[in-house]
């Protein structure tokens, strides 16, 4: 069985303020079954970004649709970017449980944010 | 944002006491929070964690006696203290941890004192 | 895990003067320094992270310097409701988070 891998391709990603970003994942594998989620940081301060499953994320959107069946794009877009926004994003694959256990973290993308163009 | 904290007082030593830290003001769920504990006339201590994933984090002393845990529902943060010694004696802050690991929220702490 | 010393221990100072404050790493932090106040009775409040930015609310008295291992915090004109103890924290290394043990800053 092929182990899976939590792909972040991009490293760095640079949005104007204003602009959405776009912060790119894939997983290499469907099983084991359990949701994705996107966190902003490790460690205690770990913030929750996305939750394919549960919780209200109004800035959030997939960028490929999550009920979609094979679908292993769990790709996001954050609208209306602000400085506040940068930090280092991990997209986290979970196998189902109660709870939910991690499995498998992406490398991380730094989301850097540019002035808004005058 | 708010934080309130709860359920401090006088435990003798080998006793239990769990404080309660009520959130309100940001999306609770999502975010890292923490105790932090300053015994009289001393400084700041990190005490334990839970982040937006719900992983734990512990500072050596208190691993094995201490279990932090959080009622996402509820918007409230436990700290579950055990076998109590006098040098666990302190105010308890509960705090809101930012993603890059600071406190950039804090309560106005409850008062812990183990004494016989 | 890393310690954090913060010196002097007290400082005596009258207002309207300026005030630095020094914290000492024992490992490179890579500037992730956190500076809060404290007043007698009062929970801390964050002033300063990254170890230049300054937090939401914070006049712009106070500053934060720094890099490697030692970081300053500077208050240029020292107002009366500026006395009190200010902490260090890095937050580099979680495991686990540290302080420094406080400079207190009183009425000369």
């Known amino acids: 069985e092929e182990e899976l891998q939590v792909i972040q391709p991009e490293k760095s990603v640079s949005v104007a303020a204003g602009e959405s970003a776009t912060l790119n994942c894939t997983a290499t594998s469907l099983i084991p079954v359990g949701p994705i989620q996107w966190f902003r940081g490790v460690g205690p301060g770990r913030e929750l970004i996305y939750h394919q499953k549960e919780g209200h994320f109004p800035r959030v959107t997939p960028v490929s649709d999550p009920t979609k069946r094979n679908n292993m794009d769990f790709s996001i877009r954050i609208s209306n970017i602000t400085p506040a926004d940068a930090g280092t994003y991990y997209c986290v694959k979970f196998r189902k449980g109660s709870p939910d256990v991690e499995l498998k973290s992406g490398a991380g993308t730094e989301l850097s944010v540019r002035a808004k163009p005058s | 944002v708010q934080l309130v904290e709860s359920g401090g007082g006088l435990v003798q030593p080998g006793g239990s006491l769990r404080l309660s830290c009520t959130a309100s003001g940001f999306t609770f769920r999502n975010y890292g929070m923490s105790w932090v504990r300053q015994a009289p006339g001393e400084g700041l201590e990190w005490v334990s964690a839970?982040?937006?994933?719900?992983?734990?984090y512990y500072t050596d002393s208190v691993k094995g006696r201490f279990t932090i845990s959080r009622d996402n529902s509820k918007n409230t943060l436990y700290l579950q203290m055990n076998s109590l010694r006098a040098e666990d004696t302190a105010i308890y802050y509960c705090a809101k941890v930012t993603w890059n690991n600071f406190f950039d929220y804090w309560g106005l702490g409850t008062l812990v004192t183990v004494s016989s | 895990e890393i310690v954090l010393t913060q010196s002097p221990g007290t400082l005596s100072v009258s207002p309207g003067e300026r005030v630095t404050l020094t914290c000492r790493a024992s490992?490179?932090?890579?500037?992730?320094i956190a500076w809060y106040q404290q007043k007698p009775g009062q929970a801390p409040r964050l002033l300063i992270y990254d170890a230049s930015s300054r937090a939401t609310g914070i006049p712009g008295r106070f500053s934060g310097s720094g890099s490697g291992t030692e970081f300053t915090l500077t208050i240029t004109s020292l107002q009366s409701e500026d006395f009190a103890v200010y902490y260090c924290?890095?937050?580099?290394?979680?495991?686990?988070?540290?302080f420094g043990g406080g400079t207190k800053v009183e009425i000369k």
């Open positions: 839970s982040s937006g994933s719900g992983s734990t």
């Open positions: 924290q890095q937050h580099y290394d979680w495991s686990p988070l540290t």
């Open positions: 490992q490179g932090i890579a500037g992730k």
